[in-house]
């Protein structure tokens, strides 16, 4: 607890002090007082630098004195032999004695009293910026007129803060300008303009004179401009060192003028005005700005239009342009929107074809569609190459956005038919020789696949069963083989309108217009064992001449059995119709003259006993295309005959091409169109 006075005596005083002693006293007087310590008696063994025995006086970290020996007062009116005056309120006294004393020493007697200190004069650092007033136990600071005491109660400054400037134009100067500005002051000025305007400050070099920087380059007095998170300055020196025109990019500006205690100059004067906030002319790739200007300011609106092949994607919606407004903060609205390359997306897949996964689906990318060769080809041309167009579609030079269509290649067997031996008199065949061959199991007959959805057959095959079961892709018609082959399900049977339906079909003598079409429920997938035969063209090139060769195939009756297990085939020449007329009907159901022969029939056979027979009906009489030797077309359909192993009659398909095309077109599905 601090005290105002006290006494300090060496151990055993006034007796001799003992050897090997160290004792300390901590003196503390109240705050605001100093300490006056005085010794009235001093008798301590003398040594050089008081190394043996001593009394030491310490103030903080400073040794105020170290005493030893004997002292006596110089003043007969005062008992004081040694004294210390410290301006601090704490003091430490330490007494030390070594292990031996040559004589008897009595030590010391000392007293301390609290004394007033003059804070205004006793210290190197002046506590007040202006006027210092001492009183017992303390001091206070005061200020000259027009100055006020800061909260620290030590510094005086002028009241130059708090001004807010809201006008769009104005002038601000340092206090007393052009007279010297007050020392030790912090002046803050605020400029607050409406949003959308930026504060622009203009100064003249000669209107600025502020105490220069120190040797380290630090301004002693300084002028600083703060706009949001941007700072201009600090500035000081003779003549304004910064830009004479400061665009702050902000509608709010704080001006801070800080001065120290020394070196007052005339100060500064500035002008400010509000400019509509500029927005940068941004470089937005792949777009054009409308209107184009050198400078854009607050409230300006531009339309940003993407170049061809680029689009603005916002959410899921793509647009080709957007509007942007210069906002009050100097930033463009919709600044996140960018013109990106149009993305055409993953290209649509096509039936019976493929498209390689593109490396990119962006504007300008190229993809290629291909058909599943050699069974399909691209019907609608265009080469299959598509590029990603500006409108976001995959576009072909010929077809535009229309997708390519892969349609079956017709009339090309995977393996050519070779007669292995001398159908009747025919040879074993493989389905790959006649991939268009269709097997009907009830009645036992044949047909020809002409595209994905249609089978051509004889009218007499389907007249009694309008829901025939058909199979493709198998050489053998054994049960285990058919189970592995492709079964075709009919959707509808179309019999030629010229075919006469009879009550008793077994007695038929008129096979004119013996042609029918079967529409399938599902498209047939083409491959090496399943592929269509072509239809004849309508030109005279497709008119058959006697001796023209054609191929027939089927599972009909052979010399050995009623029904063939494996596909049989034969190559037959076209013969004059009279050759067929001349053959005697084997099991006539009517008079020989009753049998009808018309130009809708082809007569073929008569060579080496090769002929079609019961069970081959509806199968194609395939002839090499005169305009493309790699292909076969269905010149005829197995229809009827006077006698197996002689000549046979075939429906002349060329005469029915118009009916076939019309029937297929009228009964096609949207998917097929």
């Amino acid at each position: 607890e601090p005290t105002m006075y006290g006494e300090i005596l060496s151990p055993n005083y006034p007796q001799a002090y003992p050897s090997e002693v160290e004792k300390s006293w901590d003196i503390e007087v109240p705050e605001g007082y100093g300490i006056h310590l005085y010794f009235t008696h001093l008798d301590i063994e003398l040594s050089e630098n008081c190394a043996y025995d001593s009394v030491q006086i310490i103030s903080g970290d400073t040794e105020e004195g170290r005493l030893c020996g004997q002292r006596s007062s110089n003043n007969p009116h005062s008992p004081i032999v040694e004294e210390f005056q410290v301006p601090y309120n704490k003091l430490q006294v330490i007494f030390k004695s070594d292990f031996s004393n040559e004589e008897r020493f009595t030590g010391f007697a000392a007293y301390y009293v609290a004394t007033d200190i003059n804070e205004c004069t006793d210290f190197v650092d002046v506590p007040c910026s202006h006027f210092c007033n001492n009183f017992i136990g303390g001091y206070f600071c005061s200020c000259p007129p027009e100055y006020f005491l800061h909260d620290d109660m030590k510094n005086c400054g002028v009241n130059c803060s708090g001004d807010v400037f809201t006008a769009l134009i104005g002038e601000i100067a340092s206090p007393n300008y052009p007279k010297p500005y007050p020392e030790n002051s912090r002046c803050e000025y605020q400029i607050r303009l409406e949003k959308g305007f930026q504060v622009v400050v203009t100064l003249r070099r000669e209107d600025f004179d502020v105490e220069a920087a120190d040797s380290a380059g630090n301004c002693l007095d300084s002028l600083v401009f703060v706009a949001g998170d941007r700072q201009f300055g600090p500035y000081c020196g003779h003549g304004f060192p910064g830009p004479l025109n400061i665009e702050t990019k902000s509608n709010a500006l704080d001006i801070i003028f800080q001065t120290d205690l020394t070196g007052q100059k005339k100060g500064w004067k500035l002008r400010y005005h509000g400019d509509p906030m500029p927005c940068p002319k941004e470089d937005t790739p792949n777009s054009v700005w409308e209107p184009a200007k050198a400078k854009y300011v607050f409230r300006d609106v531009v339309q940003i239009t993407c170049l061809d092949g680029f689009e603005v994607v916002e959410g899921r919606v793509g647009a080709t342009s957007f509007y942007s407004t210069c906002q009050s903060n100097g930033k463009w609205s919709n600044s996140k929107l960018k013109c990106q390359p149009v993305d055409c997306g993953i290209p649509e897949s096509i039936e019976n074809g493929k498209v390689e996964d593109p490396e990119s689906t962006l504007f300008g990318s190229v993809i290629r569609y291909t058909c599943e060769e050699p069974y399909y080809y691209m019907e609608n041309g265009g080469g299959g190459e598509y590029h990603c167009a500006g409108n976001g579609s995959w576009v072909n030079e010929v077809l535009g956005p229309e997708l390519p269509k892969c349609v079956p290649v017709c009339g090309v067997p995977r393996e050519p038919f070779e007669e292995k031996q001398r159908i009747i008199g025919g040879s074993d065949a493989d389905i790959k020789n006649f991939p268009w061959q269709v097997f009907f199991d009830n009645p036992w007959a044949g047909g020809a696949l002409i595209n994905e959805y249609w089978v051509l057959t004889a009218a007499h095959v389907v007249e009694g069963n309008r829901e025939p079961t058909m199979y493709v892709g198998s050489t053998s018609v054994q049960t285990s083989r058919l189970a592995k082959s492709k079964m075709l399900t009919p959707e509808h049977v179309f019999i030629h309108p010229g075919w006469k339906l009879l009550e008793v079909p077994e007695g038929r003598t008129n096979f004119d217009n013996d042609i029918a079409l079967v529409r399938l429920k599902d498209p047939v997938k083409m491959g090496p064992t399943v592929s269509p035969i072509c239809l004849p063209g309508t030109s005279s090139d497709y008119n058959l001449m006697d001796g023209d060769l054609g191929l027939i195939s089927g599972w009909g009756r052979t010399e050995k059995r009623d029904r063939a297990v494996r596909l049989k085939a034969a190559r037959l020449p076209v013969a004059p119709l009279r050759k067929c007329k001349e053959v005697k009907v084997e099991k006539p159901t009517a008079d020989a003259e009753a049998y009808v022969f018309t130009p809708n029939m082809i007569c073929a056979g008569g060579e080496k006993g090769m002929d079609s027979c019961k069970g081959d009906s509806g199968g194609a009489f395939a002839v090499q295309d005169p305009n493309d030797k790699t292909k076969f077309y269905a010149a005829g359909l197995v229809s009827w005959g006077p006698q197996c192993g002689t000549y046979g009659l075939y429906t002349r398909v060329k005469n029915y091409v118009d009916w076939i095309m019309k029937t297929m077109q009228e009964n096609s599905t949207p998917r097929e169109d």
Epitope: T475, Q478, T479, S480, L482, A483, K484
Partner: antibody, heavy 119, light 107 residues
Framework: QVQLVQSGAEVKKPGASVKVSCKVS????????MHWVRQAPGKGLEWMGT????????IYAQKFQGRVTMTEDTSTDTAYMELSYLRSEDTAVYYC????????????WGQGTLVTVSS | DIQMTQSPSTLSASVGDRVTITCRAS??????LAWYQQKPGKAPKLLIY???SLESGVPSRFSGSGSGTEFTLTISSLQPDDFATYYC?????????FGQGTKVEIK
């Protein structure tokens, strides 16, 4: 009409092998697919296997895999079925059967061969 | 191999009854199923092929239906000659397999 004539009844000891023959007449073996079916006394029908001429391979029922061998001699139009490592449960009538067409499983049946396995 | 399960194993019925036998395949066999009738000491006789096609010469009282995995053989009016054992057989894929049989006996 195809006719199938099988070899006569056989009595075999367990562990032995039996070879049953089936002679085709009225057609050639090359035009046909021969299947083998057996029936144990008082039991059901069991399909044993066939030669698939299209694939050129013989297909056996899982149960007989490794014990049965089916062969054909096209020069004599005779089919053979050999079953080895006989056990008592192999006692059955063994039929050769020709495969039918267009969904009909079997066309013609042999008269059957009774194989008795007994020690 | 595809498993064929017939039910019931035995069926007692009287002349004139309508009889139904069921056959279930362990996986889809489309319509590749046949039904046989067998009498003691005789080879089986084909009744139905392709699930519903009647073999020629078979009385029309026999009919078959179904596709995929569920099939039925129906005898619309049982005749004395119909007491026998009936088998289904799948011919969808080699190996072919038979059902275990259904014995139709006189009640």
């Amino acid at each position: 009409q195809v006719q199938l004539v099988q070899s006569g009844a056989e009595v075999k000891k367990p562990g032995a092998s039996v070879k049953v023959s089936c002679k085709v007449s009225g057609d050639t073996l090359t035009e046909l697919s021969m299947h083998w079916v057996r029936q144990a006394p008082g039991k059901g029908l069991e399909w044993m296997g066939t030669f698939d001429p299209e694939e050129g391979e013989t297909i056996y029922a899982q149960k007989f895999q490794g014990r049965v061998t089916m062969t054909e001699d096209t020069s004599t139009d005779t089919a053979y079925m050999e079953l080895s490592y006989l056990r008592s449960e192999d006692t059955a009538v063994y039929y050769c059967v020709t495969e039918g067409l267009a969904g009909i499983p079997f066309d013609s049946w042999g008269q059957g061969t009774l194989v008795t396995v007994s020690s | 191999d595809i498993q064929m399960t017939q039910s019931p194993s035995t069926l007692s019925a009287s002349v004139g009854d309508r009889v139904t036998i069921t056959c279930r395949a362990s996986q889809s066999i489309s319509s590749w199923l046949a039904w046989y009738q067998q009498k003691p000491g005789k080879a089986p006789k084909l009744l139905i092929y392709k699930a519903s096609s009647l073999e020629s010469g078979v009385p029309s009282r026999f009919s078959g239906s179904g596709s995929g995995t569920e099939f039925t053989l129906t005898i619309s009016s049982l005749q004395p000659d119909d007491f026998a054992t009936y088998y289904c057989q799948q011919v969808n894929s080699l190996s072919w397999t038979f059902g275990q049989g259904t014995k139709v006996e006189i009640k």
